[in-house]
């Protein structure tokens, strides 16, 4: 049994998350994950899910009753999702920590927008003509 | 020229993001994107970057001076990053909108944690033995 299971059960007790009413009104993450089979689509969704759990764990980091459980689960996420790659985890953390209300961050983000957009589609590296074929056509002239 | 370029230039003017000092202290996103070549790694990072921009745009959605620019860029992101797939965009939006301080959301998230963790690694579907090999060995028994 993976080590996170026991620790997740401990968190369930702490949050009363084993109660029957928890399942009311559908799932947060599980139904969404079931929708996406392609690895790249799954990563888009899992990225948001992992950042949610990291924020949740941060809010409870000083609670001694669950500290060990939280740390074990975070370690397991680092192995499974980030392939034990600290650089990947660090880059991810940087992205999740930027403040959207900080005017310097806003200016930088807008400054970088054109280059970010140019890289968004998987075929971004193969030039405009090939990418437009991916969109099944070209953009009409303005 | 892709349509977002003109609109991103308009945003640059609005945010004074063309000023030389904007480049001080490194980039927010570009250096991180340069680090990751694998499509699934890029999606992990781009997922966070796109959610940042969506939050930023939400904060300025009522400003008439940039409304058209913001809407054009959002449409372009939907075509390029979400493949014009509204279900993908809707699932993404649901994930970004969950409140980490809502106790019902916390309980649901903890309730789902074991199953989410079980699916985190790319090889989650190919059985325990194969997956453990992907992690370059097995975990020592507890």
């Amino acid at each position: 049994q993976d080590p996170y299971v026991k620790e997740a059960e401990n968190l369930k007790k702490y949050f009363n998350a084993g109660d029957p009413d928890v399942a009311d009104n559908g799932t947060l993450f599980l139904d969404i994950l079931r929708n996406w089979k392609e690895e790249s689509d799954r990563k888009i969704m899992q990225s948001q899910i992992v950042s949610f759990y990291f924020k949740l764990f941060k809010n409870f980091k000083d609670d001694q009753r669950i500290q060990k459980s939280v740390e074990t689960i975070k370690e397991d996420i680092n192995v499974k999702f980030f392939n034990s790659n600290k650089k990947k985890r660090d880059d991810f953390e940087k992205l999740t920590n930027y403040s959207v209300t900080d005017s310097n961050v806003q200016r930088k983000a807008v400054h970088e927008l054109i280059q970010v957009m140019a890289e968004l589609s998987p075929a971004a590296k193969i030039g405009k003509r090939k990418r437009s074929q991916m969109f099944r056509g070209r953009r009409a002239s303005q | 020229q892709d349509p977002y370029v003109k609109e991103a230039e308009n945003l640059k003017k609005y945010f004074n993001a063309g000023d030389p000092d904007v480049a001080d202290n490194g980039t927010l996103f570009l250096d991180i994107l340069r680090n990751w070549k694998e499509e699934s790694d890029r999606k992990i990072m781009q997922s966070q970057i796109v959610s940042f921009y969506f939050k930023l745009f939400k904060n300025f959605k009522d400003d008439q001076r940039i409304q058209k620019s913001v809407e054009t860029i959002k449409e372009d992101i939907n075509v390029k990053f979400f493949n014009s797939n509204k279900k993908k965009r809707d699932d993404f939006e649901k994930l970004t909108n969950y409140s980490v301080t809502d106790s019902n959301v916390q309980r649901k998230a903890v309730h789902e944690l074991i199953q989410v963790m079980a699916e985190l690694s790319p090889a989650a579907k190919i059985g325990k033995r194969k997956r453990s090999q992907m992690f370059r060995g097995r975990r020592a028994s507890q």
Epitope: W36, R138, A140 | E71, K74, D76, V79, S84, K86
Partner: antibody
């Protein structure tokens, strides 16, 4: 009230070209993707092409790409479908259909609003 | 090649329930929304279900839509069948980037 009105259909010979038009009203036209869908007499529905709203990206059915071109004029609330090298099997009723507003996560449904269609007949 | 396969015809008596299936040949049915359209002779198609299971305003709750990932199919269910429901029904979904796909259509006959 959302309205889409197609025009420009008619009888043409095989090999000829034809442009059909669609004029829209009752909504902010530039916000929405527009689809062209056709229906041959007594047959099912076949998607032809789509053009995005503000960005004007064009998407085509694999079987028609190269012969058909979609374009739009947001200032005049109009979309066009230019068809070249027409064949007998292109004979159909051509519908203009409103798509999503892809900048709005609460957009009205895709393909909710249809025009009445314009009939294109290709025959010698 | 992506296909949405529907039965050619379905029939039922007034007041009964019928189900029209729409099977996706490849790719996951859950990864794209499914819409359903009703088309009466001489009219343009009219949407009866959008985004898997939602009804546009004016469509009675006798019409319902669902998606089943295990069979990779979507279904349109019409309960309390009425003679006015007699029409052709088309499912619709997507593939690739904004590639729209229609099923071949199902002719619904209300018996009696």
């Amino acid at each position: 009230e959302v309205q889409l009105v197609e025009s420009g259909g008619g009888l043409v010979k095989p090999g000829d070209s034809l442009t059909v038009s669609c004029v829209a009203s009752g909504f902010t036209f530039s916000n929405y993707f527009i689809h062209w869908v056709r229906q041959a007499p007594g047959k099912g529905l076949e998607w032809v092409a789509t053009i995005s709203g503000r960005t004007k990206y064009m998407f085509y059915s694999d079987s028609l790409r190269g012969r058909f071109t979609v374009s739009r004029d947001n200032a005049n609330n109009s979309v066009y479908l230019h068809m070249s090298s027409l064949r007998g099997e292109d004979t159909a009723l051509y519908y203009c259909v409103r798509g999503y507003d892809h900048s709005d996560s609460n957009s009205a449904a895709d393909l909710l609003h249809w025009g009445r269609g314009t009939l294109v007949t290709v025959s010698s | 090649n992506f296909m949405l396969t529907q039965p050619l015809s379905v029939s039922g008596y007034p007041g009964k329930t019928i189900v029209i299936s729409c099977v996706r040949s490849s790719g996951s049915v859950a990864s794209h929304y499914v819409q359903w359209f009703q088309q009466r002779p001489g009219s343009a198609p009219a949407m009866v279900i959008y985004e898997d299971s939602h009804r546009p305003s004016g469509i009675p709750d006798r019409f319902s839509g669902s998606v089943d990932a295990s069979s990779n199919s979507a279904s349109l269910t019409i309960s309390g069948l009425k003679t006015e429901d007699e029409a052709d029904y088309f499912c619709q979904s997507y593939y690739g980037n904004n590639q729209v796909l229609f099923g071949g259509g199902t002719k619904l006959t209300v018996l009696g």
